[in-house]
Amino acid sequence: SGTTNTVAAYNLTWKSTNFKTILEWEPKPVNQVYTVQISTKSGDWKSKCFYTTDTECDLTDEIVKDVKQTYLARVFSYPAGNVESTGSAGEPLFTNARKFLPYRDTKLGQPTIQSFEQVGTKVNVTVEDERTLVRRNNTFLSLRDVFGKDLIYTLYYWKSSSSGKKTAKTNTNEFLIDVDKGENYCFSVQAVIPSRTVNRKSTDSPVECMGQEKGEFRE
């Protein structure tokens, strides 16, 4: 079955971070083009990246419609030209991607420390609430809006003068920690979804240290 001289796509891979979702595959096309279809388990197939010569397809627009749905996708291979001139043996070749559940499978992007403020022996560290491409009522939702209390942040902090790290956790985007007066501290945060079995943690944020721009200090 399949059309002559076409090769089925292989190595179909979902690449998804903070719901920005791209399906990638191989091989680079030679005398063929690809079309991707996506659907929910109960829905109709919708064609995307029609007759493309790329080996990736941005499916973000479709999966953000409902990030808690399960999505199916497949990649069709068509000969590069009409079938009458290239020869046909019925339906085109296609390859199924593995099921994709955005809420479960999207990776957490690297977080950013928005600010920190010291008041006496307390420091308030705020994590930037990153915007996603998920929409509700025509506005983009933040990561916290989407994941709610499923999302926590872990703060790693240490004295600039030593390497011993301490940790704190929060299910908001703010930490309030105790520090030693007169000491400078460095901070890094990590996003975590504890209920997940895979893709539980983001990479660590860039390190921010007291005595640099992002901080405010009040006695």
């Epitope: 096309p29 030679v30 007759y51 010569t53 069709f76 590069a80 030209g81 009409n82 009458e84």
Partner: antibody, heavy 119, light 113 residues
Framework: QVQLVESGGGVVQPGRSLRLSCAAS????????MHWVRQAPGKGLEWVAV????????YYADSVEGRFTISRDNSKNTLYLQMNSLRAEDTAVYYC????????????WGQGTLVTVSS | DIVMTQSPDSLAVSLGERATINCKSS????????????LAWYQQKPGQPPKLLIY???TRESGVPDRFSGSGSGTDFTLTISSLQAEDVAVYYC?????????FGGGTKVEIK
């Protein structure tokens, strides 16, 4: 010789539906991708929709997505365009066209059928 | 979406003279793997459907007179009628078939001066 003959056009009120047909002859219909292209009176050409030779994949212009549905019946050598929720701006001559040497290159066109959306 | 911009909007040329129509795409329609430009030219006479003249930017469709030629690459393309004939009075459209949605230029009307 290759022939594409559209039918089903006419005057329709906004919000109503219409189904266009395109009867194909003179070639192996099931081997070719097919398109609908429209032309508003005195204006340029606008691509509307495409369907692959097998009928599995369909793609639409943003302006008609969710309102129009392209389909084909390879046993009847016929292409269709179901147009729902019609608007005044859908008023145009609708052409069916065949993929030629490559996808999206139209080597044969029908004569067109006029759709007028007016109250 | 790739935007196709044609110039001029209209053109009046004497019989036997050269007519040149330009078409610019908002992004390249050249596919590097096969070095082909995914651009076509059509001619449309009043009351008729368009007729394919040229594809791959410079390949003449079978039966099209050799006074019609296409050139250009990447984002800038030209259709040339080397010696205008009376039957060439029409509107000419460029179209990219590089990526969907397919898009046409706004058209150039060619008339006899």
């Amino acid at each position: 010789q290759v022939q594409l003959v559209e039918s089903g056009g006419g005057v329709v009120q906004p919000g109503r539906s219409l189904r266009l047909s395109c009867a194909a002859s003179g070639f192996t219909f099931r081997s070719y991708g097919m398109h609908w292209v429209r032309q508003a009176p005195g204006k340029g050409l606008e691509w509307v929709a495409v369907i692959t030779y097998d009928g599995i994949n369909k793609y639409y212009a943003d302006s008609v997505e969710g309102r129009f549905t392209i389909s084909r019946d390879n046993s009847k050598n016929t292409l269709y365009l179901q147009m729902n929720s019609l608007r005044a701006e859908d008023t145009a001559v609708y052409y069916c066209a065949r993929d030629g040497v490559y996808y999206g290159v139209y080597d044969y066109w029908g004569q067109g059928t006029l759709v007028t959306v007016s109250s | 979406d790739i935007v196709m911009t044609q110039s001029p909007d209209s053109l009046a040329v004497s019989l036997g003279e050269r007519a040149t129509i330009n078409c610019k795409s908002s992004q390249s329609v050249l596919f590097s793997s096969n070095n082909k430009n995914y651009l076509a030219w059509y001619q449309q006479k009043p009351g008729q459907p368009p007729k394919l003249l040229i594809y791959w930017a410079s390949t003449r469709e079978s039966g099209v007179p050799d006074r019609f030629s296409g050139s250009g690459s990447g984002t800038d393309f030209t259709l040339t009628i080397s010696s205008l004939q009376a039957e060439d009075v029409a509107v000419y459209y460029c179209q990219q078939f590089h990526s969907y949605p397919l898009t046409f230029g706004g058209g150039t009307k060619v008339e006899i001066k």
